[in-house]
């Protein structure tokens, strides 16, 4: 399929001009070949009209113009004076005519408007209202008033002041007469149609003495707008409809077979299936607009999308709306990321997340897609070292590898924790990606103590069991803050006894904490990880407390305390307006929630590995 | 919906070499993980191998480690387990299934040590064949 998107149809009147833009992937070459608009023959090929490398052909000479935007990826030919044998089919591409690299654009110019004198023009949107101003003289300023529509040879009565009202205008027509000593009286028609378009007449009396006046209606359908964006990555619709419609229920529809507009996503609490997950309608502002956002792009999303309003959340006859035509880039340089990650309850998930390499100074974040009302994604956890109070201790954002990826890092699973993340940042927007976080049946491979408590001054150590699954690999422990999970010495000797089926190459890895500090209080991960890339992690919060009997203290499995309850979550939590989303700048007030817990220092920890037996009770 | 055929299966004497093969249909093969799974009658069903979507990393259950070898062959769509010096516990219907790896094909991202998802759980995997008997007579 070719990555050059343009308009399907342009359309426009005899002597006026058109501006048609071509896309392109912005690639080193395609910035710097040939682009060039040709004209189809009947028997094939192409018959270039004007090229970027300065030709154009005489039948556009002085009218036409082609203009390169490589930033953009764009490029804009643009025909003024334009006669009905302009009408035909083109193609916008880039290279060689023949090499298939183009987009097949229709364009048609038709014949301008036969108006009567006298006749006033209204151009008017689709679903949006006109107001037909007749203005009469005194001596019919007591007599009927009137509007009729020409259809074919013969006037049809649309309105008058007497109450008549034709059926295709009931509910959406009225006749205002001015007050006295304004001579004019006024049609408002509101939600117009298509079908409304067409040439009036006002008439003030019916004699020979009336007044009439002519108005020929253009009713404008929306020219689409076009949006070309990358698969994988991501596209925001903005649909500005205005304040006459603030009150009324927004949707986004898009057109399939026919005129068919089946609804994407609505404020009434719709949305289609195959959006799940990757959907935001954010709120809309006090004069009507919303925005809609859509992540994890698909060849299957390309098409034309329709936002409008109308009390039943869905496209109907006279809706206003806003179009676009949107064309998914196959040659995307959005890497392919995990849609779902499956981890175990009780265990962890390490998610990576994409990012544009050249925006390696970007904040990052991660944020839990909610498909409540209109779907909203509050903030998890960002770069810059905050993380949300419900998720203190098991949740954590690494800048690792790095070049392009960050992980995220999210244990303690419950299946509360299955659904839709999004990975962002305060860069480009067009590179938020959605996984889907599953929870699966299973045992955590890691193998530690649940809750440990230490005693202030005494030594503490804490067992983490890895299975021989994870010999070949590194293995750690950490002090989770709210920046990361900050690296304990370590060192690994010694099998464990804890698995069954599991060879000598099963470990056991100890944490020592030597002369415990009330600073030693928190949360510590025990995991795996190979160079940048993380495996498991399984966490143990170590409480401190005051001295009770002299001596070090030794947790075993056994001993430990059980695993605390999983975390509710407040349902009353702040979140962050999905409209931050656009501008991660905005989280900033968020950072108020602070980690008053110190770090521990390092050199008082230390990690020290055996086998089950042999774990003393003295620091080495 | 990918759909998963194994073949292969088949009567062997103890100390004998079987390889299985499984056939991928439908969406993007080399997107997915592929792993084989046991059941003995009357046992739960038993993880054996499993193998990262670009063939980069595998992992193996103990009990088979260095007698079987799993593989797969991208253009083929196919996996393939090698297994030698059976012993009659290997006796079973061998699944082969199909799980969507995270990272797949990513041109920037280097993938996972396949260790690293827990894919020797059978809820991991998203798609499954119908199975193939082997036995091994002693």
């Known amino acids: 399929k070719s990555p050059i998107f343009g308009p399907e149809e342009v359309n426009s009147v005899e002597g006026n001009s058109v501006s048609i833009t071509c896309y392109y992937p912005p690639t080193s070459v395609n910035r710097h070949t040939r682009k060039y608009w040709c004209r189809q023959g009947a028997r094939g090929g192409c018959i270039t009209l004007i090229s970027s490398e300065g030709y154009v052909s005489s039948k556009y000479a002085g009218r036409a113009n082609l203009t390169n935007f490589p930033e953009n990826g764009t490029f804009v030919v643009n025909i003024a004076q334009l006669s009905q044998d302009d009408s035909g089919r083109y193609k916008c591409g880039l290279g060689i005519n023949s090499r298939g690299l183009s987009f097949d654009v229709s364009l048609e110019v038709s014949q301008g408007p036969g108006l009567l004198n006298d006749t006033k023009v209204y151009t008017v949107d689709l679903g949006r209202t006109v107001t037909i101003n007749c203005p009469f003289k005194t001596e019919n300023a007591q007599k009927r008033k009137s509007l009729y529509k020409q259809i074919g040879l013969y006037p049809v009565l649309v309105i008058d002041s007497s109450g008549y009202v034709n059926p295709n205008y009931t509910g959406r027509i009225r006749l205002d007469i001015q007050g006295t000593g304004q001579l004019l009286f006024s049609v408002v028609i509101n939600q117009l149609r298509l079908s409304d378009a067409g040439q009036y007449l006002c008439q003030a009396g019916d004699d020979s003495n009336s007044n009439k006046k002519n108005a020929d209606l253009q009713v404008l359908k929306p020219e689409p707008e076009l949006v070309y964006e990358d698969l994988r990555g991501s596209v925001t619709f903005h649909c500005a409809l205005g304040p006459e419609v603030a009150n009324v229920a927004k949707f986004l529809c898009r057109q399939s077979s026919g005129e068919n507009c089946d609804v994407v996503v609505n404020t009434l609490g719709k949305r289609a299936p195959a959006f799940e997950g990757r959907i935001l309608l954010n709120p809309q502002d006090k004069d009507g607009s919303f925005s809609v956002v859509i992540t994890g792009l698909r060849k299957e999303d390309a098409g034309r999308y329709l936002c409008g309003a109308h009390s039943d959340g869905q496209l109907q006859e006279g809706s206003p709306i806003q179009a676009w035509q949107l064309f998914v880039n196959e040659e995307s340089t959005i890497p392919r990321s995990p849609t779902v990650v499956k981890g175990v309850a009780g265990s962890s998930v390490a998610v990576l997340c994409p990012y544009n390499r050249k925006e390696s100074k970007s904040i990052k974040y991660w944020c839990l897609w909610e498909g409540a009302q209109n779907g909203r994604c509050p903030l998890l956890v960002d770069s810059e070292g905050w993380v949300k109070a419900q998720y203190e201790g098991r949740l954590s954002l690494l800048e690792e590898p790095g070049n392009g990826t960050f992980t995220v890092i999210l244990n303690q699973l419950t299946s509360r924790d299955a659904g839709f993340y999004w990975c962002l940042t305060n860069g480009d927007t067009l590179w938020r990606t959605t996984v889907e976080i599953k929870i699966i049946e299973g045992e955590p491979n890691l193998k530690v103590p649940g809750n440990v408590t230490a005693v202030l001054g005494e030594t503490l150590k804490v067992p983490c069991h890895f299975p021989c699954k994870f010999s070949s690999y590194e293995k750690y422990w950490c002090k989770w803050n709210n920046t990361g999970c900050q690296a304990l010495p370590s060192q690994d000797e010694g099998p464990s006894k804890a698995f069954v089926n599991c060879d000598e190459n099963s470990r056991l890895v100890s944490l020592t904490l030597n002369l415990v500090t009330r600073a030693d209080e928190g949360w510590y991960w025990c995991g795996v990880k190979q160079g940048h890339f993380y495996g498991e992690t399984a966490a143990v919060y170590v409480a401190v407390e005051e001295r009770k009997a002299a001596g070090s203290r030794d947790v075993s499995l056994a001993k430990a305390d059980a695993a605390p309850d999983e975390k509710v979550l407040d349902s009353g939590f702040r979140e962050i307006e999905n409209k931050a989303i656009q501008d991660p700048r905005l989280f900033a007030e968020e950072k108020a929630v602070a980690d008053t817990r110190d770090q521990a220092d390092g050199s008082r920890a230390s990690v020290d590995s055996g086998s089950s037996e042999e774990q003393g009770g003295s620091s080495r | 919906q990918v759909q998963l055929v194994e073949s292969g299966g088949g009567l062997v004497q103890a100390g004998g070499s079987l390889r299985l093969s499984c056939a991928a249909s439908?969406?993007?093969?080399?997107?997915?993980?592929m792993g084989w799974f046991r059941q003995a009658p009357g046992k739960e069903r038993e993880f054996v191998a499993v193998?990262?979507?670009?063939?980069?990393?595998?992992y193996y259950a103990d009990s088979v480690k260095g007698r079987f070898t799993i593989s797969r062959d991208n253009a083929k769509n196919t996996v393939y387990l090698q297994m030698n010096s059976l012993k009659p516990e290997d006796t079973a219907v061998y699944y082969c299934?199909?799980?969507?790896?995270?990272?797949?094909?990513?041109?920037?991202?280097?993938?996972?040590?396949?260790?690293?998802?827990?894919?020797?759980?059978?809820?991991?995997?998203?798609?499954w064949g119908q199975g193939t008997q082997v036995t091994v007579s002693s």
């Open positions: 299934a199909s799980g969507e790896q995270p990272g797949s094909n990513r041109p920037y991202i280097p993938e996972q040590p396949i260790e690293f998802m827990p894919t020797d759980y059978p809820s991991w995997y998203d798609y």
């Open positions: 193998i990262s979507w670009s063939g980069g990393s595998t």
């Open positions: 439908g969406r993007t093969f080399s997107s997915y993980a």
